[in-house]
Amino acid sequence: APVRSLNCTLRDSQQKSLVMSGPYELKALHLQGQDMEQQVVFSMSFVQGEESNDKIPVALGLKEKNLYLSCVLKDDKPTLQLESVDPKNYPKKKMEKRFVFNKIEINNKLEFESAQFPNWYISTSQAENMPVFLGGTKGGQDITDFTMQFVSS
């Protein structure tokens, strides 16, 4: 059965946009004007996972690329990566757990919690031009709040 998806961009709560940094990494930085075209467009798919009024399980693929954000252990630490997949098989309604994020809406802001590693969140640094990563703390120095902008297909 087809999975429902939408196209969007994400900005952190400091209005930093997400752009590609090499083939398998995202970084966050402030963009203006024509540079806004550099920001990555996600294909957000609604997938199997824990669902409630304020929590929706999603997978975050890069639009028209066979890359998905995924959460894996590297050196015993939960780590965010961009993972290449077979485009014939993805997206699907029931994604592997490492691709699933709980999209949590709080006060018009979004958090993306890893389903594989509860209480670990997609995060950005306060500093400019730093990698997007998986962080294990909320409310500290690192930023875990995002806004979503819809993009027409």
Epitope: A1, P2, Q48, G49, E50, E51, S52, K97, R98, Q116
Partner: antibody, heavy 119, light 107 residues
């Protein structure tokens, strides 16, 4: 309270087509997937397939060539058809609901229908 | 075709902890579900998404899933927990059930 009520022929001859229908009472029909599962006597569960309100289906590859699951949203019903049955298809057949709030798994089941294939 | 392997039977004394395992290749990267089935009855969902309990399921039921093994744990097992238990997970495009485990509560 959600209820799934199922019915269909309980005794078939080899090579005939099994037909079962499941009616859903209570709750929305369009927000869920609707599944069929079977259980041969004294054995384990086997997933047959699922359908959503739009008619989109997934089937167990081992049964795919013989199975059709259909839906009638106007009656809140869905049906199972299994062609060319043999004695190996003798089982209790269950209909069930797959719900997003439980991770798209089977949270409500019908009462089961025993289907016997015998010449 | 994906395979989920369960022990055919597990025995436990009343009040003790019962653990039922379900093994499959990279099962920890999928979501695992558990059903309880008593004789002559339809299955009942007892654990979903690895470790969550549906409303009405007692707190003594818990689940975990990592590596290649999902585990259903029943702490303070009661006589009424005697039943068959089935694990389930999603393969590439279809659902797969384990072969089932008969839980016997001794005494």
């Amino acid at each position: 309270q959600v209820q799934l009520q199922q019915w269909g022929a309980g005794l078939l001859k080899p090579s005939e087509t099994l037909s079962l229908t499941c009616a859903v009472y209570g709750g929305s029909f369009s927000d869920y997937y609707w599944s069929w599962i079977r259980q041969p006597p004294g054995k384990g569960l086997e997933w047959i397939g699922e359908i959503d309100h739009s008619g989109s289906t997934n089937y167990n590859p081992s049964l795919k060539s013989r199975v059709t699951i259909s839906v009638d949203t106007s009656r809140n019903q869905f049906s199972l058809s299994l062609s060319s049955v043999t004695a190996a298809d003798t089982a209790v057949y269950y209909c069930a609901r797959a719900s997003p709030s439980s991770g798209w798994t089977l949270d409500y089941w019908g009462q089961g229908t025993l289907v016997t294939v015998s010449s | 075709q994906s395979v989920l392997t369960q022990p055919p039977s597990v025995s436990v004394s009343p009040g003790q902890t019962a653990s039922i395992t379900c093994s499959g290749d990279k099962l920890g990267d999928k979501f695992a579900f558990w059903y309880q089935q008593k004789p002559g009855q339809s299955p009942v969902l007892v654990i979903y998404l690895d470790n969550k309990r549906p409303s009405g399921i007692p707190e003594r039921f818990s689940g975990s899933n990592s590596g290649n093994t999902a585990t259903l744990t029943i702490s303070g097992t009661q006589a009424l927990d005697e039943a068959d238990y089935y694990c389930q997970a999603w393969a590439d495009s279809f659902e797969v059930f384990g072969g089932g485990t008969k839980l016997t509560v001794l005494g």
